[in-house]
Interface confidence: low
C-alpha cells in the first residue's frame, strides 16, 4: 500500500506547480548530489546559486554560487563541504553536499541570478538519514506523513558515494564548447593575421566575424573581456 501511495504522490507532484518541494535524502557521513534541471535557453548567460531557506518565510541565505565568469560555470566551486557546478548547455545545476551531517538538513533553493534578482529553479528539502542496514528498494522511500507540511513533496533518493579528493569529473558539454570556441578564435586570429600580412593590410581593419560556437541560432556566445581581441 505504501509504494502505491508513493507512486500517486510522485505522479501528483509532477503534474503540480513548478515550485513544489523536491526531497533529496542522503546518508549521514556520505555525499549527496542534488540536481536542479532548468531551461538552458531561458537562463542563458545567468549565474546560479544554492541558498538555504531561513525559516518558512525567511530569506534565502547564499551558500555557494557558480563561477563569476558564466563561461566557467562548469568549474566546481566549493564553500566548506558544499560544491556547485553548472552544465549550462545541458541545463542542469548540480550541488554536492559532502560528509552529510544533521545540520545539513533543511530547506534550500536552486537559483538563477540576473542582476540583483534571483529566480527559483527548484525548492529542495534535504533530509539526512541514518545508515541503511541494507539496500532498500523504491518502496522504502520516505514520503511526507501526517505530521509533515510538504504534501506535494517529490522524493529523490539521491544517496551518492563519497567523492575522492581531487577527483575530476568528465568535462560537461560546456567545457567542450569553451575549448572549441577558444580553438576557433585562435584559428580566426591566425587567419586574420595571415590575411593581413598577405594583403599588406593592418590587423585592426579586418572586418569582424560573427562567432556562434555551435549553439542554437540566435544565441551568441558572450564576448568576455578576457577573450576579446585575442
Amino acid at each position: 500500500m505504501e509504494p502505491l501511495r508513493l507512486l500517486i504522490l510522485l505522479f501528483v507532484t509532477e503534474l503540480s506547480g513548478a515550485h513544489n518541494t523536491t526531497v533529496f535524502q542522503g546518508v549521514a557521513g556520505q555525499s549527496l548530489q542534488v540536481s536542479c534541471p532548468y531551461d538552458s535557453m531561458k537562463h542563458w548567460g545567468r549565474r546560479k546559486a544554492w541558498c538555504r531557506q531561513l525559516g518558512e518565510k525567511g530569506p534565502c541565505q547564499r551558500v555557494v554560487s557558480t563561477h563569476n565568469l558564466w563561461l566557467l560555470s562548469f568549474l566546481r566551486r566549493w564553500n566548506g563541504s558544499t560544491a556547485i557546478t553548472d552544465d549550462t548547455l545541458g541545463g542542469t545545476l548540480t550541488i554536492t553536499l559532502r560528509n552529510l551531517q544533521p545540520h545539513d538538513a533543511g530547506l534550500y533553493q536552486c537559483q538563477s541570478l540576473h542582476g540583483s534578482e534571483a529566480d527559483t529553479l527548484r525548492k529542495v528539502l534535504v533530509e539526512v538519514l541514518a545508515d541503511p542496514l541494507d539496500h532498500r528498494d523504491a518502496g522504502d522511500l520516505w514520503f511526507p506523513g501526517e505530521s509533515e507540511s510538504f504534501e506535494d513533496a517529490h522524493v529523490e533518493h539521491s544517496i551518492s558515494r563519497s567523492l575522492l579528493e581531487g577527483e575530476i569529473p568528465f568535462p560537461p558539454t560546456s567545457i567542450l564548447l569553451l575549448l572549441a570556441c577558444i580553438f576557433l578564435i585562435k584559428i580566426l586570429a591566425a587567419s586574420a593575421l595571415w590575411a593581413a600580412a598577405w594583403h599588406g593590410q593592418k590587423p585592426g581593419t579586418h572586418p569582424p566575424s560573427e562567432l556562434d560556437c555551435g549553439h542554437d541560432p540566435g544565441y551568441q556566445l558572450q564576448t568576455l573581456p578576457g577573450l576579446r581581441d585575442t
Partner: antibody, heavy 126, light 107 residues
Framework: QVQLVQSGAEVKKPGASVKVSCKAS????????ISWVRQAPGQGLEWMGW????????NYAQKLQGRVTMTTDTSTSTAYMELRSLRSDDTAVYYC???????????????????WGQGTLVTVSS | EIVLTQSPATLSLSPGERATLSCRAS??????LAWYQQKPGQAPRLLIY???KRATGIPARFSGSGSGTDFTLTISSLEPEDFAVYYC?????????FGGGTKVEIK
C-alpha cells in the same frame, strides 16, 4: 499523552548480552526515531545511537559499533536495544527517548529527545 | 567528535537567585544545541532546543542563548524544584554528544 515505558532492571554477568525494550504510546510510532542514551552511576549522559521506526535505519556511536543492535517492532510500537559482550563498565541506566523524527529535517527541533523513558538499570557483575 | 564543556561543575545558589550556566563547544554547532534538566532518580527532561526555544510546558524563567561555540542557560529566579543537574547536548554532528553537566544545588 506521549509515553515511553521501558522494561525492568537486569543483572548480567560479564560477556553476556542484555536486551532492553521501550514501548511507545500516544503518537504515531513510525513517524519518529528512538534514541538510546545511557548513564553510568554518578556520571553524565552518553548517546548510544538511534533507530528510525519508519524504516529501521540506524546510527550507532562508534565506540559501541559491533556490540549494539537497535531494532523496532512496529506492530507493537516497541523499540529494542541489545548490548552484547557486556563488561563491568556497561553498568548504567539505559534510557530510550523519542526523537529524532524519521529523517533529520529543519533546525534542531527535529532531533530533540523528548520525552524519555523512565530508564532501565543494567548491572554487570560477576 | 564535538566536546561540550559545561561550567561551573557545581553552582550553589539560594531560591530566588539568578542562575547562569555555560556550555562551550570544541567547534561551532551553530544553534543546534539543547538543554536538559535531570533530577535524582529521574530521566532527563527537555528544557530548551535550537539554543533558545523553550520546550512545551517549560516555565518562562528558563531561557537559552548563544550560537556557534558559546551557550548559556539562564534561570531568572530559582524555584525549589529547579535544583537539579543540567546537561547541554549538541545535535549538529555525529556522534551527538552531551556536556558533563552542571549541578545547581541549594546554598
Amino acid at each position: 499523552q506521549v509515553q515511553l515505558v521501558q522494561s525492568g532492571a537486569e543483572v548480567k554477568k560479564p560477556g553476556a548480552s542484555v536486551k532492553v525494550s521501550c514501548k511507545a504510546s500516544g503518537y504515531t510510532f513510525t513517524n519518529y526515531g528512538i534514541s538510546w542514551v545511557r548513564q553510568a552511576p554518578g556520571q553524565g549522559l552518553e548517546w548510544m545511537g538511534w533507530i528510525s521506526a519508519y524504516n529501521g535505519n540506524t546510527n550507532y556511536a562508534q565506540k559501541l559499533q559491533g556490540r549494539v543492535t537497535m531494532t523496532t517492532d512496529t506492530s507493537t510500537s516497541t523499540a529494542y536495544m541489545e548490548l552484547r559482550s557486556l563488561r563491568s563498565d556497561d553498568t548504567a541506566v539505559y534510557y530510550c527517548a523519542r526523537g529524532p523524527t524519521k529523517a533529520y529535517y529543519g533546525s534542531g527541533s527535529y532531533v530533540v529527545f523528548d520525552p524519555w523513558g523512565q530508564g532501565t538499570l543494567v548491572t554487570v557483575s560477576s | 567528535e564535538i566536546v561540550l564543556t559545561q561550567s561551573p561543575a557545581t553552582l550553589s545558589l539560594s531560591p530566588g537567585e539568578r542562575a547562569t550556566l555555560s556550555c562551550r563547544a570544541s567547534q561551532s554547532v551553530s544553534s543546534y544545541l539543547a538543554w536538559y534538566q535531570q533530577k535524582p532518580g529521574q530521566a532527563p527532561r527537555l528544557l530548551i532546543y535550537d539554543a533558545s526555544k523553550r520546550a512545551t510546558g517549560i516555565p518562562a524563567r528558563f531561557s537559552g542563548s548563544g550560537s556557534g561555540t558559546d551557550f548559556t542557560l539562564t534561570i531568572s529566579s530559582l524555584e525549589p524544584e529547579d535544583f537539579a543537574v543540567y546537561y547541554c547536548q549538541q545535535v549538529s554532528l555525529f556522534p551527538l554528544t552531551f556536556g558533563g553537566g552542571t549541578k545547581v544545588e541549594i546554598k
